[in-house]
């Protein structure tokens, strides 16, 4: 998916009150300093691709994060203000139906949160260069 | 089952407001954005815009941006479409329709409508 | 916004035929087109969503095809019941659009 036409500012917004703090939950008791970023993005589009693909693409060591609460408002997001978005979901969701896993909370996980974190905050200041 | 039930007809003076309530039940209010549609008398159907309680934002057509709000209460899983300023071609039925936002992605339940009248 | 046109506006038809309507898309909008049927006093009712993606409890004479700019509702032998306004609908971005509508009535 090209998220080259989706509604940034209404992403960027979603984001700020509500996403963000989500994502600050479930690192809750973990120290900031604790994971390097090593996932970087250059531009808005770009920082969707990675974010989708950290959220929801099933990695070693940490099965799924797609049920978690900055999930699902991730989904509704980029369903709602990303043109055709939605429709290629349809297909996906029904195969996450199949493969609903309990949630559980790896070190793994914590890492790839942290990643998403620092995606989320280069997608809101996108006019920075990139170090 | 799922039901998406609107308050009465309405009766409104040029000028005034209208407050339109879509009361849901039947399924997980956060799960669907609450979408309004409204259809004049023998006329297409037009949207006006979404409420999204997951994420606690709302989303306009540019045709009525600064008079419709909609809002919803969670709590009691009410959603609500005020249309401010009316005129006579206001005069019309008001829907509320759920949509999913994390899945089925299309607007598969309606409530009955709203028929509000504009007249002096 | 992006403009759907149906066509015909509308199609008198006898029961047992077979009806064919079309909605054309202002621009390319994939498969993100819904198809809905309403009768008089009646809200809307979803038949097919995704283009073609059925429904449950929607007869299996109701079918959906298209992508792109071009979509087609056809139901295959109508039934009395079937004579209505059908309406196409785009969710691929907003303002969310719909067609003009499609009456379908009793030749």
């Known amino acids: 998916y090209d998220f080259t036409n989706c509604d940034f500012e209404k992403i960027k917004a979603a984001y700020l009150s509500t996403i963000s703090k989500d994502l600050i939950t479930y690192m809750s008791g973990t120290k900031s300093t604790e994971f390097n970023n090593t996932v970087s993005c250059s531009n808005r589009p770009h920082c969707l691709t990675e974010i989708q693909s950290l959220t929801f693409n099933p990695t070693a060591g940490c099965a799924s994060l797609a049920k978690e609460m900055f999930a699902m408002k991730t989904k509704a997001a980029l369903a709602i203000w990303c043109p055709g978005y939605s429709e290629t979901q349809i297909n996906a969701t029904q195969a996450m139906k199949k493969a609903r896993k309990s949630k559980v909370t790896t070190n793994k996980c914590l890492e790839q949160v942290s990643q998403l974190q620092g995606l989320w905050r280069r997608f809101n200041r996108p006019l920075l260069k990139q170090q | 089952q799922v039901q998406l039930v609107q308050s009465g007809p309405e009766v409104k003076k040029p000028g005034s407001s209208v407050k339109v309530s879509c009361k849901a039940s039947?399924?997980?209010?956060?799960?669907?954005?609450m979408h309004w549609v409204r259809q004049r008398p023998g006329q297409d159907l037009e949207w006006m815009g979404t409420?999204?309680?997951?994420?606690?934002?709302?989303d306009y057509n540019q045709n009525f941006k600064g008079r419709a709000t909609i809002t919803a209460d969670k709590s009691t899983s009410t959603a609500y479409m005020e249309l401010s300023s009316l005129r006579s071609e206001d005069t019309a039925v008001y829907y509320c329709?759920?949509?999913?936002?994390?899945?089925?992605?299309?607007?598969?339940?309606w409530g009955q409508g709203t028929l509000v009248t504009v007249s002096s | 916004e992006i403009v759907l046109t149906q066509s015909p506006g509308t199609l008198s038809l006898s029961p047992g035929e077979r009806a064919t309507l079309s909605c054309r898309a202002s621009?390319?909008?994939?498969?993100?087109v819904h198809w809905y049927q309403q009768k008089p006093g009646e809200a809307p009712r979803l038949l097919i969503y995704?283009?073609?993606q059925s429904i449950s409890g929607i007869p299996d004479r109701f079918s959906g095809s298209g992508s792109g700019t071009d979509f087609t509702l056809t139901i295959s032998r109508l039934e009395s019941e079937d004579f209505a306004v059908y309406y196409c609908?785009?969710?691929?971005?907003?303002?969310?659009?719909f067609g003009r509508g499609t009456k379908v009535e009793i030749k």
């Open positions: 329709a759920r949509m999913g936002v994390t899945h089925s992605y299309v607007m598969d339940a």
């Open positions: 039947g399924y997980i209010f956060t799960d669907y954005a």
């Open positions: 409420f999204i309680p997951l994420l606690d934002t709302s």
């Open positions: 621009q390319h909008i994939s498969r993100s």
């Open positions: 995704f283009a073609s």
């Open positions: 609908q785009q969710s691929y971005s907003f303002p969310y659009t």
